[in-house]
């Protein structure tokens, strides 16, 4: 009985289409597949950023695969051919591994790359990224930001740079159509007449860096002799009500501080008839139903009541 063998895929390579971290892994069928014409050959692909402890593993019948990587580090990948047991009258047959690597040859020392990159998607509408220049770089150094997400034909450069002393230190992005719930890739590179500048790559999803506007129209309503309902409205903008969590800070008579987190635009507070003053503020955040993470809004304007009329039905500012 001759042992069944199969060759690894040919021409295995990682291709960079210029999408700032979204790479193509592609290959060709193995040589000498004539014996298995009736067979659907599969491929097991493993890949990771160099330094990562775990491989991502994909089994596919295709000759390509696409995924996002951190281009600050190298990438390694390996692939082998799988012949299913139906093709071999027995157990699955695997080829040896074909391996490949990819990295962007780094220019400049690490200290020259941008520092403290910070991106916030204000009210799910306006993306603003800011950074500090690299350590020890001269004022002739300038940084340029490029971005890409699935749906764009090619990487785009920042439209509106924020500057300090003539250097770009931030970017206000233009309208980003259909850009959430997918990886958003950024590269900040630089140029200087004196020394090469190291590029930096960043990947995130926009819905996870949203900072909403604070809630508005805070009001009080007396529900009963010992209950007051605090109400507010969702901030203006594209974020639906179902996406908000709220944090409330309530101060009674300048002493008691109550904090609470709620999912709705109301909160019922137990009070006593002795309460002379009541103040509260609210802030908002995108909740776990709409994002994996988020940033608390600023606090709303304070809404206060003081005096004799706490027993009246509706208390407005």
């Amino acid at each position: 009985d001759t042992e069944i063998k199969v060759n690894p895929p040919q021409d295995f390579e990682i291709v960079d289409p210029g999408y700032l971290g979204y790479l193509y892994l592609q290959w060709q069928p193995p040589l000498s597949l004539d014996h298995f014409k009736e067979c659907t050959v599969e491929y097991e692909l493993k890949y990771r950023n160099i330094g990562s402890e775990t491989w991502k593993t994909i089994i596919t019948k295709n000759l390509h695969y696409k995924d996002g990587f951190d281009l600050n580090k190298g990438i390694e990948a390996k692939i082998h051919t799988l012949l299913p047991w139906q093709c071999t009258n027995g157990s699955e047959v695997q080829s040896s591994w074909a391996e490949t690597t990819y990295w962007i040859s780094p220019q400049g020392i690490p200290e020259t790359k941008v520092q403290d990159m910070d991106c916030v998607y204000y009210n799910w509408q306006y993306l603003l990224c800011s950074w500090k220049p690299g350590i020890g770089v001269l004022l002739d150094t300038n940084y340029n930001l490029f971005y890409w997400y699935e749906g764009l034909d090619h990487a785009l450069q920042c439209v509106d740079y924020i500057k300090a002393d003539g250097q770009n230190i931030g970017c206000r992005f233009p309208y980003l159509e259909a850009s959430d719930y997918k990886d958003f890739y950024i590269c900040v590179n630089g140029s200087s007449e004196n020394k090469p500048i190291r590029s930096s790559y960043f990947t995130f999803q926009l819905q996870n860096i949203v900072k909403p506007l604070p809630p508005v129209y805070l009001t009080f309503t007396r529900e009963s002799s010992c209950e007051i309902k605090l109400k507010w409205s969702i901030p203006l903008g594209p974020i639906p009500a179902r996406c908000f969590d709220y944090e409330i800070e309530i101060r009674e008579d300048d002493t008691t501080l109550v904090t609470a987190t709620v999912e709705n635009e109301t909160y019922t507070l137990k009070t006593t008839n002795e309460t002379r003053q009541l103040c509260f503020v609210v802030r908002s955040k995108v909740n776990i139903y709409c994002s994996d993470d988020g940033i608390w809004s600023e606090w709303s304007d304070k809404q206060c009541w003081e005096g004799e009329d706490l027993s009246k039905k509706t208390l407005l500012r």
Epitope: Y122, Q125, Y126, L128, L152, D153, L156, Q157, V159, D160, I162, K163, A164, I169, G170, R172, F173, P174, Y175, L213, E298
Partner: antibody, heavy 119, light 111 residues
């Protein structure tokens, strides 16, 4: 709620200066550009310049030949536009107007300040 | 400076009918894959209001009957079904280059 509240109407003599203020509230002042636009009576709109409060970067319309100075005070969320060497054709309503970058246009406007230049 | 030329200067349209205003730039206002052309509505005694930015994106709270189209040098504002409250002066504007410039305005009236 976003609000841009401008200072009151002014009557000025030719050759003098006027300084119009614009107090912003309801948003993070430094995240947005502040533009100044004027409109002479019965006429169209003329862009005068803009300031980026985030970094103090300013662009002017050169048609005003160094007569206009735009400033911003982040601590009070207030923008200012000063126009010097006034002449009668500077009689206009002056608007401050907020915009997020160049791709978004100008989404909130102040109520306008009428400046009348007359001897 | 980029010159924005609007046509017509004035327009009278019946209620419920379509109104179309054109704007031509003296050079392309496209860059970075974006058309830096905006449309504003101004009613008497009021500041302008943003209707359309980036040629075709609706401003916040703008009714769906307002739409924008075009790229390069030619842009159009369309009101699909004219309402009485749409009587105003409409301005196009470019924000590609400093100085930002406005068209001369189109006065829209009811026929």
């Amino acid at each position: 709620q976003v609000q841009l509240v401008q200072s009151g109407a002014e009557v000025k003599k030719p050759g003098s200066s006027v300084k119009v203020s614009c107090k912003a509230s309801g948003y993070t002042f430094s995240n947005y550009l502040m533009n100044w636009v004027r409109q002479a009576p019965g006429q169209g709109l003329e862009w005068m310049g803009r300031i980026d409060p985030y970094d103090g970067d300013i662009d002017y319309n050169q048609n005003f030949k160094d007569r206009v100075t735009i400033t911003a005070d982040k601590s009070t969320s207030t923008a200012y536009m000063e126009l010097s060497s006034l002449r009668s054709e500077d009689t206009a309503v002056y608007y401050c107007a907020r915009g997020y970058g160049t791709a978004y246009g100008v989404d909130y406007w102040g109520q306008g300040t009428l400046v009348t230049v007359s001897s | 400076d980029i010159v924005m030329t609007q046509s017509p200067d004035s327009l009278a349209v019946s209620l419920g009918e379509r109104a179309t205003i054109n704007c031509r730039a003296s050079e392309s206002v496209d860059n970075y894959g974006i058309s830096f052309a905006n449309w504003y509505q101004q009613k008497p005694g009021q500041p302008p209001k943003l209707l359309i930015y980036a040629a075709s994106r609706q401003g916040s709270g703008v009714p769906d009957r307002f739409s924008g189209s075009g790229s390069g040098t030619d842009f159009t504002l369309t009101i699909s079904s004219l309402q009485a409250e749409d009587v105003a002066v409409y301005y196009c504007q470019q924000s590609k280059e400093v100085p930002w410039t406005f068209g001369g305005g189109t006065k829209l009236e009811i026929k």
